[in-house]
Amino acid sequence: MCYGKCARCIGHSLVGLALLCIAANILLYFPNGETKYASENHLSRFVWFFSGIVGGGLLMLLPAFVFIGLEQDDCCGCCGHENCGKRCAMLSSVLAALIGIAGSGYCVIVAALGLAEGPLCLDSLGQWNYTFASTEGQYLLDTSTWSECTEPKHIVEWNVSLFSILLALGGIEFILCLIQVINGVLGGICGFCCSHQQQYDC
């Protein structure tokens, strides 16, 4: 088992996932590709929690770059033992992974709440309302009710798709950070076993 390479793999994955989270969150601000709803403040309250931008995005880049840095070969070591420094680095990566868990957890929770509440839309009564808030998420199973939202166009599909993507991406980030916690603990305790001869591809 090569703990450094595993961490690097996780790091690169997290960068990609973080960028996707940021993109998904930004798209939530532009239902149907229009800017007017953001300027009129006619967006779901959970869009303003920046769960994809901050939680699953920026906050995830910190652990990602820490994990990527773990595989570098110029680790100075300590007490004359090269592996000791690498062990310290692996254990410190656990802290970074915990930050990642917090960020991805935040992203997952907000996305789940956003899905459960449904979008803010102009309902069949001509009011801006959380039309599906009282359905406890049941609206997700009954697409015939989605026409209750008259504006923005396709807002239910837009919200459901993007919050689902954030939920999935946040969930994957959470799992990867959890794996890195285990990887970091094992790497720190068992030692940094990668030799220059071993080549692992992600």
Epitope: L125, W128, T150, E151
Partner: antibody, heavy 120, light 106 residues
Framework: EVQLVQSGAEVKKPGASVKVSCKAS????????VKWVRQAPGQGLEWMGW????????IYAADFKGRVTMTTDTSTSTAYMELRSLRSDDTAVYYC?????????????WGQGTLVTVSS | EIVLTQSPATLSLSPGERATLSCRAQ?????INWYQQKPGQAPRLLIY???NLASGIPARFSGSGSGRDFTLTISSLEPEDFAVYYC?????????FGGGTKVEIK
Amino acid sequence: EVQLVQSGAEVKKPGASVKVSCKASGYTFTNYGVKWVRQAPGQGLEWMGWINTYTGNPIYAADFKGRVTMTTDTSTSTAYMELRSLRSDDTAVYYCVRFQYGDYRYFDVWGQGTLVTVSS
Amino acid sequence: EIVLTQSPATLSLSPGERATLSCRAQSGISFINWYQQKPGQAPRLLIYGTANLASGIPARFSGSGSGRDFTLTISSLEPEDFAVYYCQQWSSNPLTFGGGTKVEIK
């Protein structure tokens, strides 16, 4: 001046269709909804549904679902209401009405009305 | 469907008198709007949101009420006030109107 101008009176046979137009002027058409109401001779007012002029999404009253189609043409600021399978009890004055979205959703501007007579 | 019952169906009064029109909802609603209609004309908005006077409407018209019971009051009838008055709710679909109260000259 804010106004809604409707098309002229129509006489139709039972089973036929009628399409009433409603041209808006004096305001930004897509900022308000358009509601359709009818009034049979000597009777009260009956709501038929409304259309979101920005998205074109209509909401129909249950009594008219499947028989009515509401559309808009934003390029000419015109709303349309088509009623199919006409019966004699569809004889009424049909009004288009502007309303503002929000808490009270009141109907402040009314068209002059279009009399549709269904007779064999 | 929320049924609105207006009473009385006809109100016979003289100019200068006070008119009180009632609108009762079958179940509790958040607000009501009032309209005036004269023969051969489209209805005209008088009161919106239960108590707010529409633009260009004289101050002799006022609205009040909450829950199920709502009232339109004309403090002193003018000759042009003799017409049919409708209340309307849109707290839930379908939007409904009351049957109307005709205010006629005694």
